[in-house]
């Protein structure tokens, strides 16, 4: 009876995600067969989040919209470890929007999920950010410094990275 109600709950949760994520990849968390964590196929997973590299070229606003219709946001990078994971899936000759912007052009950077912007956990390329008209952040590769962040005009189409919390069923 307990197993039955658990299964019914799982099925209703899966139905919620079905519109945009017809297929989920789930792994068993820990030793308990009851707990599964899932990411949409073919998203990748790291710690408690799922990541998707969007290869369509869009402005920052539309990139965020694209993530939101999939139940995600543009990526918020919280640690060096998280960035190191993300860059494994990126192409060196491309740039990708992050969920970081400076809407007023006053160098008040803010993350899309309202995570406080912490200057100590940022990975700007040297000399960046450098232009008040460039109010959106990308991650890209520079041969001298490897992967880092750069500010760019928000209307210039780029690829992007979406992030969502893992789905627990």
């Amino acid at each position: 009876n307990f197993m039955y109600s658990k299964t019914v709950k799982r099925l209703s949760k899966l139905r919620e995600y079905q519109q945009y994520h017809p297929s989920l990849t789930c792994v068993m968390e820990g030793k308990d067969i009851e707990d599964w964590s899932c990411c949409p196929t073919p998203w990748t997973s790291f710690q408690s989040s799922c990541y998707f590299i969007s290869t369509g070229m869009q402005s920052w606003t539309k990139s965020q919209k694209n993530c939101s219709v999939m139940g995600a946001d543009l990526v918020v990078i919280n640690t060096r470890e998280e960035q190191d994971f993300i860059i494994q899936n990126l192409k060196r000759n491309s740039s990708y929007f992050l969920g970081l912007s400076d809407p007023g052009g006053r160098r008040h950077w803010q993350w899309v999920d309202q995570t406080p912007y912490n200057e100590n956990v940022t990975f700007w390329h040297s000399g960046e950010p450098n232009n008040l008209d460039e109010r959106c952040a990308i991650i890209n590769f520079r041969s001298s410094e490897e992967w880092g962040w750069n500010d760019i005009h928000c209307h210039v189409p780029q690829k992007s990275i979406c992030k969502m919390k893992k789905i627990y069923i």
Partner: antibody
Framework: QVQLVQSGAEVKKPGASVKVSCKAS????????IHWVRQAPGQGLEWMGT????????SYNQKFKGRVTMTRDTSTSTVYMELSSLRSEDTAVYYC???????????WGQGTLVTVSS | DIQMTQSPSSLSASVGDRVTITCRAS??????LAWYQQKPGKAPKLLLY???TLAIGVPSRFSGSGSGTDYTLTISSLQPEDFATYYC?????????FGGGTKVEIK
């Protein structure tokens, strides 16, 4: 007032290159991105790509990749679109257009007719 | 790439007529759609953006509607200066493709 003034008509031979200019005035040149759109005689409109005059960042329509190059000169508030390896199908009016704050083309140049003929 | 299919390709109408032009996208463009008017030998002029927002200086007889993949431009009462070619364009992702155009001619 905002103005985009383009260079004059050009006649080119197949295989040659053409460079069309678009001089902006009436606004801060480096604050708005510029797009290029072309229109073959009696045909519809075709998006070619965009350039950000501040940093020089570009994004091109894959159809033209390798043949189109967009550049800018901030000292003269001018954007350039160069198309190489011209063929007769490239005969068209080439327009530059400014993308406004709302992310649509709010101002257009008057157009530059490029004729490719042997 | 998202394709834009505009219909009809041409239509004949009289002054005072109500005119409707449709544009269908091959994928969801989330209302990121513009409508332009173009007269012979001139550059296109922005009429509406975000599917239904009137551009500055555009008469209120022009209106737009739609969502997802299907969008409409309506001219409530056609005026002599409205005889022109109309284009839709999406701005969801590059390439920002245009519809094939609708030529509005005098009946």
């Amino acid at each position: 007032q905002v103005q985009l003034v383009q260079s004059g008509a050009e006649v080119k031979k197949p295989g040659a290159s053409v460079k069309v200019s678009c001089k902006a005035s009436g606004y801060t040149f480096t604050s708005y991105i510029i797009h290029w759109v072309r229109q073959a005689p009696g045909q519809g409109l075709e998006w070619m790509g965009t350039i950000y005059p501040g940093g020089g960042d570009t994004s091109y329509n894959q159809k033209f990749k390798g043949r189109v190059t967009m550049t800018r000169d901030t000292s003269t508030s001018t954007v350039y679109m160069e198309l190489s390896s011209l063929r007769s199908e490239d005969t068209a009016v080439y327009y530059c257009a400014r993308m406004g704050d709302n992310e649509y083309f709010d101002y257009w140049g008057q157009g530059t007719l490029v004729t490719v003929s042997s | 790439d998202i394709q834009m299919t505009q219909s009809p390709s041409s239509l004949s109408a009289s002054v005072g007529d109500r005119v409707t032009i449709t544009c269908r996208a091959s994928g969801n463009i989330h209302n990121y759609l513009a409508w332009y008017q173009q007269k012979p030998g001139k550059a296109p002029k922005l009429l509406l953006y975000d599917a239904e927002t009137l551009a500055i200086g555009v008469p209120s007889r022009f209106s737009g509607s739609g969502s997802g993949t299907d969008y409409t431009l309506t001219i409530s009462s056609l005026q002599p200066e409205d005889f022109a070619t109309y284009y839709c364009q999406h701005f969801w992702s590059t390439p920002y493709t245009f519809g094939g155009g609708t030529k509005v001619e005098i009946k």
